[in-house]
Amino acid sequence: QRTDSIPNSPDNIPLRGGNCSEDLLCILKRAPFKKSWAYLQVAKHLNKTKLSWNKDGILHGVRYQDGNLVIQFPGLYFIICQLQFLVQCPNNSVDLKLELLINKHIKKQALVTVCESGMQTKHVYQNLSQFLLDYLQVNTTVSVNVDTFQYIDTSTFPLENVLSVFLYSNSD
Amino acid sequence: QRTDSIPNSPDNIPLRGGNCSEDLLCILKRAPFKKSWAYLQVAKHLNKTKLSWNKDGILHGVRYQDGNLVIQFPGLYFIICQLQFLVQCPNNSVDLKLELLINKHIKKQALVTVCESGMQTKHVYQNLSQFLLDYLQVNTTVSVNVDTFQYIDTSTFPLENVLSVFLYSNSD
Amino acid sequence: QRTDSIPNSPDNIPLRGGNCSEDLLCILKRAPFKKSWAYLQVAKHLNKTKLSWNKDGILHGVRYQDGNLVIQFPGLYFIICQLQFLVQCPNNSVDLKLELLINKHIKKQALVTVCESGMQTKHVYQNLSQFLLDYLQVNTTVSVNVDTFQYIDTSTFPLENVLSVFLYSNSD
């Protein structure tokens, strides 16, 4: 998997003529249509409600730091998080909640109730996802909060819990 | 949030040479790669099965009118709707349904059953989403229908119920 | 619905000057920003865990063969599958599972438990989706596996069960 950032951003390239002026492939490779994306899987060992992620996932034009995706190029981003829960039902219902935070503020949340029958069962699977389309500035942080993080099964389902962002439209 | 339309669409710009011919940034800013998108939150007060939306959300190259997103540029669109339900369980199961309509025709729906134990409980959360990838023409309408709209909690969860579209590929 | 592939790919076009050099629309239509996408609905009659799809859906720059989407252009793809289940509850809970496979390897799965009360009910609806962002090479296959395929309701919900991919960023 590539984990490259964007060392040679179009911003660093002189955009006028020169030897490139007639070479359309050259021209278009220098085009101001930046693309940035990330696709990270949850860290193996979770010990707090703010989720941590494996930084060896796909990172391109986005940084990862202390549980946060950090935006490097401003624009309109599509953000999506998907989590796989495995709940050993107690004798009451359980509310699973996924919060998407932008700069430590709650931007969007998803909730689902499981174990609603109130019966102690072997296990119940639940999948929960949340998406967001939002303008993000440089250094904006994107993070995920899950109160019931103990129900995120990172051992059986290490690939199922992901946070992904991609730039849809830059703000040039 | 920006709610700009596209007053200076590339269609209105002469695409031949002139003073712009050597300025690559100028050339590429006039490129025929339109982008259109919308991200609207549900209106506070719902009183019918066809959902209404807050028109002060993100709208770019898409219009909002009478519960409909109205397409302004033809192309292949990604459409996604996500709803957060809060159900005060009666003593029977409840089927929650989300319908995506294109030009008033049901194009795709999602259903989930809650309160299946038949026990009257305090409340049950359920999150439901639906997506679509489709070619849309100019003036095509996109709308959402929910039979059980009374269970959409717009007061506690005003940000959780959204309809979003974005143009993936225009039809040039 | 259009089901065109890409007969005149930019790769086959000489990208230097000529009569096109001053015509920016012409230049940009030859740009190396390939787009590939697919949106297929599940086949009417399912008889095995590997799902089959209607090949008369939307296919552009992607082939369909024997239950697989076959990638024709390398790059970073967004892959999403959504399934609508209708379960006649037995007297035990049922685990529904959706697996996304890349080259016959399980890349990501989603699970949800229904009928958890253990009561035999008339029916229970459940909607399950799964997404993936991944680099795919030419001839990579994308497929979907569902252990409980008998619960996918293709008659009542022929449009609700879909597999979709689209190229986010090519690997030029």
Partner: antibody, heavy 124, light 110 residues
Framework: QVQLQESGPGLVKPSETLSLTCTVS????????WTWIRQPAGKGLEWIGR???????NYNPSLKSRVTMSVDTSKNQFSLKLSSVTAADTAVYYC??????????????????WGQGTTVTVSS | QSALTQPASVSGSPGQSITISCTGT?????????VSWYQQHPDKAPKLMIF???NRPSGVSNRFSGSNSGNTASLTISGLQAEDEADYYC??????????FGGGTKLTVL
Amino acid sequence: QVQLQESGPGLVKPSETLSLTCTVSGGSISSYYWTWIRQPAGKGLEWIGRIYTSGITNYNPSLKSRVTMSVDTSKNQFSLKLSSVTAADTAVYYCARERVVGASRYYYYGVDVWGQGTTVTVSS
Amino acid sequence: QSALTQPASVSGSPGQSITISCTGTSSDVGLYNYVSWYQQHPDKAPKLMIFEVNNRPSGVSNRFSGSNSGNTASLTISGLQAEDEADYYCSSYTSSSTWVFGGGTKLTVL
């Protein structure tokens, strides 16, 4: 201007249930979280829980098994029940309003309106 | 949920600045920018002074300001005045959709 007034018995016997009501005047009860907070004499504030007009509740985990809150929008009132009380539940009980606004994100404006408090003593 | 940690007391002379700290965990103060500060005079109900870390409600003096770093929030009062003498409580929203208060700090104006 919104005002809150707590009411209920000032004395409750151990093992019984403490019941308090808060009446909201000068404004609507809709679109806010309504909160109960207590303060034992000479000690700090303790958050008990909150209820939204939709009926959604959040309770302090340490009190959750004993707390029930309800809201009556027609009377502009909300109430607190605390079961199986002991002397440790003796305190001044405040009802209060918490303002949360969902706009471009969730804005938490804190507890901006308080009742004057009512003293509840648990004793036999 | 454990109470947030505040110093039991702080003091300062009129005109000086003082800072009250409030230490929590990664599930409250460290997680959200949802920290509030309250002032309570003897035998009175508390009054909201700061919300969302550093925002003042209308009517609150701009001598009051807040900040947040890691798992610790702070309230700073500049140009200390006699009427600032009171108890101060921090409060943070938590990951379980609840609120938690600090133990309180008694401010003495010398």
